[in-house]
Interface confidence: low
């Protein structure tokens, strides 16, 4: 006598949004408010994530899926599923343990998150600097002076102190 799957496990019939209630003869009970089950056959419903404080709700919890959070203005998500919110900085800054600090000379950050990165070293590619870098923007490399056609004005490369990696301490 071969029993069917649902006889072996009555809980397999419980749809998402319910849980298999062992206290009620394994009948499918609806997930209580503020809880969810995202797959069938679950024996408990999970508590919905609550987006509090610096987190705000991006998607409400339903009986079949958890809430999703993002961060309030001035903060951005970090980690899987936005597990943390990190403070935004301005462009041209990076977040340190002491707060937002301007990028050191020779580095830039064009986003509100992340770290300051060195300007591109145009000379490594045999190019010259077409537009100087700033705290917010990388340098723009142009053709090397040798590539310029006669009569075209050459672009003066930056002074050595402006090379990346030589930031004042």
């Amino acid at each position: 006598f071969e029993r069917t799957r649902s006889l072996q496990d009555p809980c397999s019939n419980c749809p998402a949004g319910t849980f298999c209630d062992n206290n009620r003869n394994q009948i499918c009970s609806p997930c209580p408010p503020n809880s969810f089950s995202s797959a069938g056959g679950q024996r408990t419903c999970d508590i919905c994530r609550q987006c509090k404080g610096v987190f705000r709700t991006r998607k409400e919890c339903s009986s079949t899926s958890n809430a999703e959070c993002d961060c309030t203005p001035g903060f951005h998500c970090l980690g899987a599923g936005c597990s943390m919110c990190e403070q935004d900085c301005k462009q041209g800054q990076e977040l340190t343990k002491k707060g937002c600090k301007d990028c050191c000379f020779g580095t830039f950050n064009d986003q509100k998150r992340g770290i300051c990165r060195p300007w591109t070293n145009c000379s490594l590619d045999g190019k010259s600097v077409l537009v100087n870098g700033t705290k917010e923007r990388d340098v723009v490399c142009g053709p090397s002076p040798a590539d310029l056609s006669p009569g075209a004005s050459s672009v003066t490369p930056p002074a050595p102190a402006r090379e990346p990696g030589h930031s004042p301490q």
């Epitope: 019939n13 419980c14 749809p15 998402a16 949004g17 609806p30 797959a39 339903s62 079949t64």
Partner: antibody, heavy 116, light 107 residues
């Protein structure tokens, strides 16, 4: 806004199969299961089964086991219900319905007529 | 399977009337009951879930109550748009089952 749009009416001969589609929009398809319900002329609503749209696992009502197949295509946000070995009693309007705490949004229905 | 028995099967009423439809479950279904409205040739629309919670956009004249085996849908003041067939449904256990419907018609 949430919308479920079903395929058009079908006329089938006894013994044939029919496949009805249900295209979802206005929400994340894999966040909610999809159920299929039918209604014969002048009759009550009859539940046929459901599919976990995330995993693709279907569950069927006993009365339809062996004759119904519910599938989904997540890339198209579409669920399908295929009913085989059709008989005249299968003449009905077939509905798909998104499922949250209840069947909260329904397709417009697909009339399937089984006639020789 | 759990049987859901609705009464009355037909109800004649006038605009402005208070209308009550009842639904009895063959066994305890906790509060896992929904109510739907269906107009001729149209798909059902969810009105109430968890016995008493109104679905988004449903007018406040619709209310639901009950738990266990006895449930009620009340329309406090019937409007012309409310003439339709109403179904209860339990979602306590698989398979979800529907009542036979109550047709609310113009007196």
């Amino acid at each position: 806004q949430v919308q479920l749009v079903q395929s058009g009416a079908e006329v089938k001969k006894p013994g044939a199969s029919v496949k009805v589609s249900c295209k979802a929009s206005g929400y994340t398809f894999t966040d909610y299961s999809m159920h299929w319900v039918r209604q014969a002329p002048g009759q009550r609503l009859e539940w046929m089964g459901w599919i976990n749209t995330e995993t693709g696992e279907p569950t069927y009502a006993d009365d339809f086991k062996g004759r119904v197949t519910i599938t989904r295509d997540t890339s198209a946000s579409t669920a399908y219900m295929e009913l085989s070995s059709l008989r005249s009693e299968d003449t009905a309007v077939y509905y798909c319905a998104r499922y949250d705490y209840a069947m909260d949004y329904w397709g417009q229905g697909t009339l399937v007529t089984v006639s020789s | 399977d759990i049987q859901m028995t609705q009464s009355p099967s037909t109800l004649s009423a006038s605009v402005g009337d208070r209308v009550t439809i009842t639904c009895k479950a063959s066994q305890d279904v906790s509060s896992a009951v929904a109510w739907y409205q269906q107009k001729s040739g149209k798909a059902p629309k969810l009105l109430i879930y968890w016995a008493s919670i109104r679905h988004t956009g449903v007018p406040s004249r619709f209310s639901g109550s009950g738990s266990g085996t006895e449930f009620t849908l009340t329309i406090s003041s019937l409007q012309p748009d409310d003439f339709a067939t109403y179904y209860c449904q339990q979602r306590y256990t698989t398979p979800p089952t529907f009542g036979g419907g109550t047709k609310v018609e113009i007196k």
